[in-house]
């Protein structure tokens, strides 16, 4: 299918002008190639009328032009002084007329209505309000005022000053007669319907002295705004319906093949399951305007969208609406990042998030999509280092690998972490993406002690067991803080050949803190990586306590390397299930924020990678 997109149907009246905007993928080639507007003939050939290379056909001379906007990936064709002869089938496109990089546009130019002299024309969008002004002479001031609608040769009474209201206008029309001295009455019609379209007649008095005024009411369906977005990207529909519906339920719906409109989301809590995890209705402003964000755009999301207001939260005739025609470009610059990432309970996930590579300095964010009501996405972590409190010690956002991708690591997974998450930046909003985390059956590959208590001034050794499948990858320990995870210095303790024939069940990489200081308290992660790509991580919390007086019981400070499934106990720390280790306050009364700068100096923190059988090996 062609990636060029424009309006399918354009209609206008003789003598008027039209402006036709066509969209194309803004690749370097497309930006500089020829743009054209051509008319399809009976033979099927498309005859150029105007092009970006300066050509204008004789028929269009002096009344048409084509302007390219390469930075936006759009070009605009303006045609003035329209005549009925301009009605027909056209194409806007790129390159050669016959190549297929084009979009079909139907232009219909109609004859303007023949209106009686002195007719006032009112042009109003459907659902809005019109005020028809009806002047009268002094002698008709005390007499009956009325508004009629002309249908063919007959006139049907709509409203009069004797309290008659035509049933078709019930609860949405009023006739206002001003105080003395003002020789004008007004008729206000709210929530206009397409069927209200037509010629009206104001009348004051009767007989030959009556006052009459013609009004032509043109009720328009809102012209859909064309929206051109990339596959996998994000779109925002801004909906401003006016103060009069500020307190009415709002909705976004999509027009289906039956020309009815299926609710996508509304403020009453309804949401189409096809948009689960990738839609938000942002709270409305005081003026009643609101916006709907959809991420992870799919080709099947294409179509006509309407936003509106109604107490039922769905489309009803005569209520204000706004319209968009969404085109999803498959020649997307947005990469195919994962829509689902799976991890095991107790394990971890490393999520790769795309961003516009031209915006490497932008702030990166990760938020959790919550579906309740209109949906919300509270931030969990950002590249400046803020982490929501309940995620302390188990969530980190890394700028790596860079060049259009950042990484988010979440560990100590529980079934409660299953759900939808959004990758965001403070830059190009079209690059918002959604990823679903699923928790599957299985065991974490990395095994660390449940929790560890270290003794001030002593040596602490924490083991991390890893399986053979990680033997060829880099292993690391790092100290977690809310600005990231500072890698601790590693020590290569032997030849890497020790890992080549990996036939034992597991291997070991150990973290040594020597001597333990107060600043060592906190979360530590053991992980595997390959260059800038992160694999599994496991977290352990280290609590630091004073040396015990003789007679008290604690784990030998020199070693905390219990077998992977053992609980590590001490007199100062109650036994806690691994999955509950999310809040350091469960462990320690005093939480000292570690100074990560302290980690690099000297040999007080080291990582030792070895097999479980022998001390050979390295952390590569």
């Amino acid at each position: 299918k062609s990636p060029v997109f424009g309006p399918q149907e354009v209609s206008s009246v003789e003598g008027n002008s039209v402006s036709i905007k066509c969209y194309y993928p803004p690749t370097s080639v497309n930006r500089h190639t020829r743009k054209y507007w051509c008319r399809k003939g009976a033979s099927g050939r498309c005859i150029t009328l105007v092009s970006s290379e300066g050509y204008v056909s004789s028929n269009y001379a002096g009344r048409a032009n084509l302007t390219n906007f390469p930075e936006n990936g759009t070009f605009v064709v303006n045609i003035a002084q329209l005549s009925r002869d301009d009605s027909g089938h056209y194409k806007c496109g790129l390159g050669i007329n016959s190549r297929g990089l084009s979009f079909d546009v139907s232009l219909e130019v109609s004859q303007g209505p023949e209106l009686p002299n002195g007719t006032e024309v009112y042009t109003v969008d459907v659902g809005r309000t019109v005020t028809i002004k009806c002047p009268f002479k002094t002698e008709n001031a005390p007499k009956t005022k009325a508004l009629y609608k002309k249908i063919g040769q007959t006139s049907v009474l709509v409203i009069d000053s004797r309290n008659y209201v035509n049933p078709n206008y019930k609860d949405r029309i009023r006739l206002r007669i001003p105080g003395t001295g003002q020789l004008i009455f007004t008729v206000v019609i709210d929530r206009l319907r397409l069927s209200d379209h037509g010629l009206y007649l104001c009348q004051a008095g009767d007989g030959s002295n009556r006052d009459e005024k013609n009004a032509d009411l043109q009720v328009l369906e809102p012209e859909p705004e064309l929206v051109y977005e990339d596959l996998r990207g994000s779109v925002t529909f801004h909906c401003a319906l006016g103060l009069e519906v500020a307190n009415v339920a709002k909705f976004l719906c999509r027009v289906n093949s039956r020309e009815t409109c299926d609710v996508v989301i509304n403020t009453l809590g309804k949401r189409d399951s096809a948009f689960e995890g990738r839609i938000l209705l942002n709270p409305q402003d005081k003026d009643g305007s609101f916006s709907v964000v959809i991420t992870g755009l799919r080709k099947e999301d294409e179509g006509r969208y309407l936003c509106g207001a109604h107490s039922d939260g769905q489309l009803q005739e005569g209520w204000p609406i706004q319209a968009w025609q969404l085109f999803v470009n498959e020649e997307s610059t947005i990469p195919r990042s994962p829509t689902v990432v799976k991890g095991v309970a107790g394990g971890s996930v490393a999520v790769l998030c795309p961003y516009n590579p031209k915006e490497s300095q932008s702030l990166k964010y990760w938020c959790l999509w919550e579906g309740a009501q209109n949906g919300r996405c509270p931030l969990l972590v950002e590249s400046q280092g803020l982490v929501q409190e309940q995620y302390e010690g188990r969530l980190s956002l890394l700028q790596e690998p860079g060049n259009g991708t950042f990484t988010v690591i979440l560990n100590q997974l529980t079934t409660q972490d299953a759900g939808f998450y959004w990758c965001l930046t403070n830059g190009d909003t079209r690059w918002r993406t959604t990823v679903e985390i699923k928790i599957i059956e299985g065991e974490p590959n990395l095994k660390v002690p449940g929790n560890v208590t270290a003794v001030l001034g002593e040596t602490l050794n924490i083991p991390c067991h890893f399986p053979c499948k990680f033997s060829s990858y880099e292993k690391y320990w790092c100290k977690w803080s809310n600005t990231g995870c500072q890698t601790l210095p590693s020590q290569d303790e032997g030849p890497s050949e020790a890992f080549v024939n990996c036939d034992e069940n597991s291997r070991l990489v150990s973290l040594t803190l020597n001597p333990v200081t107060r600043a060592d308290e906190g979360w530590y992660w053991c992980g595997v990586k390959q260059g800038h790509f992160y694999g599994e991580t496991a977290a352990v919390y280290v609590a630091v306590e004073e040396k015990k007086v003789a007679g008290s019981r604690y784990v030998s400070p020199a070693k905390a390397d219990a077998a992977p499934d053992e609980k590590v106990l001490d007199s100062g720390v109650r036994e806690i299930e691994n999955k509950a280790i999310q809040d350091p306050r469960l462990f320690a009364e005093e939480k000292v924020v570690a100074d990560t700068g302290d980690q690099a100096g000297g040999s007080r923190a080291s990582v030792d990678s070895s097999s479980s059988e022998e001390q050979g090996g390295s952390s590569k």
């Epitope: 095991v344 060049n403 299985g442 390959q530 694999g535």
Partner: nanobody
Framework: QVQLVESGGGLVQAGGSLRLSCAAS????????MGWFRQAPGKEREFVAV????????YYADSVKGRFTISRDNAKNTVYLQMNSLKPEDTAVYYC???????????????????????????????WGQGTLVTVSS
């Protein structure tokens, strides 16, 4: 939706070879990691091998390492399992499976090593074939 159909199973003598194929329908084949599992009578389904979407990363169960080779042809939407030096204990129904893998053949989202995902668990995979029987006689 992805449909998977295995073929190539049969009876073979110990020490012999077989090549299993798995044909996938669905245009997103190239964005899925493809794995082989096997299930012997009365036993649990067991991981055999997995290959990343690009074919650049593979991972094998220790029991088949050096004897089996997994490969894929994205143009043909097919994944293969070449089985050499077959043993009687390799007798099982072999299943092909696919799971969405982080990574892409487009720029910016690079491929992570397949070992970094829990691909040795059946629940990691989204789609499964019906299986093909391999019998190794002694």
């Amino acid at each position: 939706q992805v449909q998977l159909v295995e073929s190539g199973g049969g009876l073979v003598q110990a020490g012999g070879s077989l090549r299993l194929s798995c044909a996938a329908s669905g245009r997103t084949f190239s964005s899925y990691a493809m794995g082989w599992f096997r299930q012997a009578p009365g036993k649990e389904r067991e991981f055999v091998a997995v290959i990343s979407w690009s074919g650049g990363s593979t991972y094998y169960a220790d029991s088949v390492k050096g004897r089996f080779t997994i490969s894929r042809d994205n143009a043909k939407n097919t994944v293969y399992l070449q089985m050499n030096s077959l043993k009687p204990e390799d007798t099982a129904v072999y299943y092909c499976a696919s799971g969405e893998q982080p990574g892409s053949n487009r720029p910016y989202i690079p491929e992570q090593p397949i070992e970094f995902m829990p691909t040795d668990y059946p629940s990691w995979y989204d789609y499964w074939g019906q299986g093909t029987l391999v019998t190794v006689s002694s």
